[in-house]
């Protein structure tokens, strides 16, 4: 036998009380899937979340953050304080990187400067709290007389 | 026993109004979201309006808003829906409902009550 409450759309939940008839979602209430047999409360995007999408009967509301912050999580379940480049937030608030650090970008953490020396290169410009260093080549490459352009290897016939 | 009694229906001409009232017994008006419901021949029912959030929100069915008014009396525990330019689609049962709301978070209504009848034509 047939679940009559199988033919309740999206949108509408399976009233027990009604003989099993389909009846529709409250208002801030929705259900995404058929069959179902309550509704569900709509999200609601307060304080500092804002809305990105309006609660449907069939769909529920989806937030985002408000200038200034940034969603965290899935479905951006949580708002985190924006900082500027250059800078982490703490738990006293947004503090610079320190020396040898760099964040570039409003959220995360300040990670330290790339050490050029590990890949045998040296410091073409020089990092900021913003900013990563930049590698320039090794310094065997810029030796005098070196060309820190390598020509590519002539190609080969086949057969020598 | 929590009873809903509807009153206020009747026949009006298209651009007339009527004040539909729902008195309420066995649990108290405020401290619930409320609203009504409607039924229209052939159909399946329709959220009109409702008063959510114990008062903090209203909600109007997009086909009502501008015509119709939700509001409740507190003290005479009823709760009303003023409507006017009256639609001959505004034709249907007009029912008072409950919102139930369940303890794993999922929501339903409760409408007890027979329902009153409005009816709009010429």
């Known amino acids: 036998l047939q679940d009559p409450c199988s033919n309740c759309p999206a949108g509408t939940f399976c009233d027990n009380n009604r003989n099993q008839i389909c009846s529709p979602c409250p208002p801030n209430s929705f259900s995404s899937a058929g069959g179902q047999r309550t509704c569900d409360i709509c999200r609601q995007c307060k304080g500092v979340f804002r809305t990105r999408k309006e609660c449907s009967s069939t769909s529920n509301a989806e937030c985002d953050c408000t200038p200034g912050f940034h969603c965290l999580g899935a479905g951006c379940s949580m708002c985190e304080q924006d900082c500027k480049q250059g800078q982490e937030l703490t738990k006293k608030g947004c503090k610079d990187c320190c020396f040898g650090t760099f964040n570039d970008q409003k959220r995360g953490i300040c990670r330290p400067w790339t050490n050029c020396s590990l890949d045998g290169k040296s410091v073409l410009v020089n990092g900021t709290k913003e900013r990563d260093v930049v590698c320039g080549p090794s310094p065997a490459d810029l030796s005098p007389g070196a060309s820190s352009v390598t020509p590519p290897a002539p190609a080969r016939e086949p057969g020598h | 026993e929590v009873q809903l009694l509807e009153s206020g229906g009747g026949l009006v001409q298209p651009g007339g109004s009527l004040r539909l009232s729902c008195a309420a017994s066995?649990?108290?008006?405020?401290?619930?979201?409320v609203g009504w419901v409607r039924q229209a021949p052939g159909k399946g029912l329709e959220w009109v309006s409702a008063?959510?959030?114990?008062?903090?929100?209203?909600y109007y069915a997009e086909s009502v808003k501008g015509r119709f008014t939700i509001s409740r009396d507190n003290a005479k525990n009823t709760l009303y829906l003023q409507m006017s330019s009256l639609r001959a689609e505004d034709t249907a049962v007009y029912y008072c409902?409950?919102?139930?709301?369940?303890?794993?978070?999922?929501?339903?209504?409760?409408?007890r009550g027979q329902g009153t009848q409005v009816t709009v034509s010429s």
């Open positions: 066995g649990f108290t008006l405020s401290a619930e979201d």
């Open positions: 409902a409950r919102v139930i709301y369940h303890a794993g978070g999922g929501v339903t209504y409760d409408y």
């Open positions: 008063i959510l959030d114990h008062g903090g929100s209203t």
